[in-house]
């Protein structure tokens, strides 16, 4: 394996809970700048499995506002603009990492938390269960 | 806005960069359990806008390996199983938080970073530009 030497300038942790509790710089670096000039925010309307976005707010969490996708229909929109129930609109779900204040209401102490969010919807062929 | 009083049991931060640098408990709590009984991981194959997963690795980041969705086709799969180029397969993107070692190779000091990942694809009606 690749062996990377420890940086001699690393901060020491005197915390008795180390390594469970570490220092994290919250000056969030955004690597997304200009990565995708074609990124579109209107797919939720143009998709054959369109979705609505619902606001979920929690002041004890970072990010405090998360927008969740909810598929508009059980089926998918066909070429005529009608809902085709032979196909299914399903949410694409993704686990994301958030920070939760712990203990609650503390401005400088957090815990990492994994939550499941629906990002958008896609149209899939249904799984048909044949009854014997 | 709602004013939440500061918890008197909060840890103090002596760090000169406070509140940019905070204490984070790395014992990741999973809030997903039992939230979604219908969660499926095979949509990437069953979608009318199917996708493949491509590996991106960075040992200084957690998670170090990120599999990104890349749509298989420009068009979408129709009822006959053929690609219909009158529709477009497009990636659904999501901003996620990752942790980066900072300074590099330090085991107990991190920085939060936001990156944009493609988590799946959806089928959309194309935007048609009419030439005058």
């Amino acid at each position: 394996g690749i062996t990377i030497p420890r940086n001699p300038g690393c901060p020491n942790s005197e915390d008795k809970n180390f390594p469970r509790t570490v220092m994290v710089n919250l000056n969030i670096h955004n690597r997304n700048t200009n990565t995708n000039p074609k990124r579109s925010s209107d797919y939720y309307n143009r998709s054959t499995s369109p979705w609505n976005l619902h606001r979920n707010e929690d002041p004890e969490r970072y990010p405090s506002v998360i927008w969740e996708a909810k598929c508009r229909h059980l089926g998918c929109i066909n070429a005529d603009g009608n809902v085709d129930y032979h196909m299914n609109s399903v949410p694409i779900q993704q686990e994301i990492l958030v920070l939760r204040r712990e203990p609650p209401h503390c401005p400088n102490s957090f815990r990492l938390e994994k939550i499941l969010v629906s990002v958008g919807c896609t149209c899939v062929t249904p799984i048909v269960h044949h009854v014997a | 806005g709602i004013t939440i009083p500061r918890n008197p049991g909060c840890p103090n931060s002596e760090d000169k960069n406070f509140p940019r640098t905070v204490m984070v408990n790395l014992n990741i709590h999973n809030r997903n359990t039992n939230t979604n009984p219908k969660r499926s991981s095979d949509y990437y194959n069953r979608s009318t806008s199917p996708w493949n997963l491509h590996r991106n690795e960075d040992p200084e980041r957690y998670p170090s390996v990120i599999w990104e969705a890349k749509c298989r086709h420009l068009g979408c799969i129709n009822a006959d199983g053929n690609v219909d180029y009158h529709m477009n397969s497009v990636p659904i993107q999501q901003e996620i938080l990752v942790l980066r070692r900072e300074p590099p190779h330090c085991p107990n000091s991190f920085r939060l970073e936001k990156i944009l990942v493609s988590v799946g694809c959806t089928c959309v009606t194309p935007i048609v530009h009419h030439v005058a």
């Epitope: 390594p19 994994k114 | 040992p59 957690y62």
Partner: antibody, heavy 126, light 107 residues
């Protein structure tokens, strides 16, 4: 190619401790976790605990809490499992396994054990 | 903790036969269920991850299905080399747990 090579068999007295090592090669050590799984003679598999090498943070099964310590040394790409207060019930083959922790298909960090060490037999006998 | 119950405990089969092993979780685990094969005196080997995803190098006769609480491992056309014990494993929540195992031998 990923390889996990474990230390040799150990014979220990009741009440003593054992420390088993798992040397990883192939790929970046901090890109995945290492879990420890044991198998008593003629029995099934039992998860002991695991470590996220990127953070150096370990999680343990409640059953072993307080007498197991899992650590990782990045400089030698080696993980260790130390079990104390040994009894005859701890006689087993101890395996290390790679825990991928990959952002994949809706999961922030996957936890299937894709590569395994060859196993270390620990015998506890007076 | 999440309990995984496999059935059957033991199966004796003839080559080319189809083998089905089930694994039931005591609570919903989504798709976080994996299958391993262990041959005598060998380490376990990952066969299927996340309920239905095949692993590179594993023969295509091995397949998995299910989600929530009920999962199935299928061996389509068993071969002599498939003799061994099969385990399911959940990674939805700590502590990770395994099924008790299903031993498959060849008649």
């Amino acid at each position: 190619e990923v390889q996990l090579v474990q230390s040799g068999a150990e014979v220990k007295k009741p009440g003593s401790s054992v420390k088993v090592s798992c040397k990883a090669s192939g790929g970046s050590f901090t890109s995945y976790g290492i879990s420890w799984v044991r198998q008593a003679p003629g029995q099934g598999l039992e998860w002991v605990g695991g470590i996220t090498t990127f953070f150096g943070v370990a999680d343990y099964a409640q059953k072993f809490q307080g007498r197991v310590t899992i650590t990782a040394d990045e400089s030698t790409t080696t993980a260790y499992m130390e079990l104390s207060g040994l009894t005859s019930d701890d006689t087993a083959v101890y395996y290390c396994a790679r825990d991928p922790h990959e952002f994949w298909n809706g999961y922030y960090a996957t936890h299937d054990f894709d590569y395994w060490g060859q196993g270390t037999t620990v015998t506890v006998s007076s | 903790e999440i309990v995984l119950t496999q059935s059957p405990d033991f199966r004796s089969v003839t080559p080319k036969e189809k083998v089905t092993i089930t694994c039931r979780a005591s609570q919903n685990i989504g798709s976080a269920l994996h299958w391993y094969q262990q041959k005598p005196d060998q380490s376990p080997k990952l066969l299927i991850k996340y309920a239905s995803h095949s692993i590179s190098g594993v023969p295509s006769r091995f397949s998995g299905s299910g989600s929530g609480t009920d999962f199935t491992l299928t061996i389509n056309g068993l071969e002599a080399e498939d003799a061994g014990t099969y385990y399911c494993h959940q990674s939805d929540d700590l502590p990770y747990t395994f099924g008790q195992g299903t031993k498959v031998d060849i008649k």
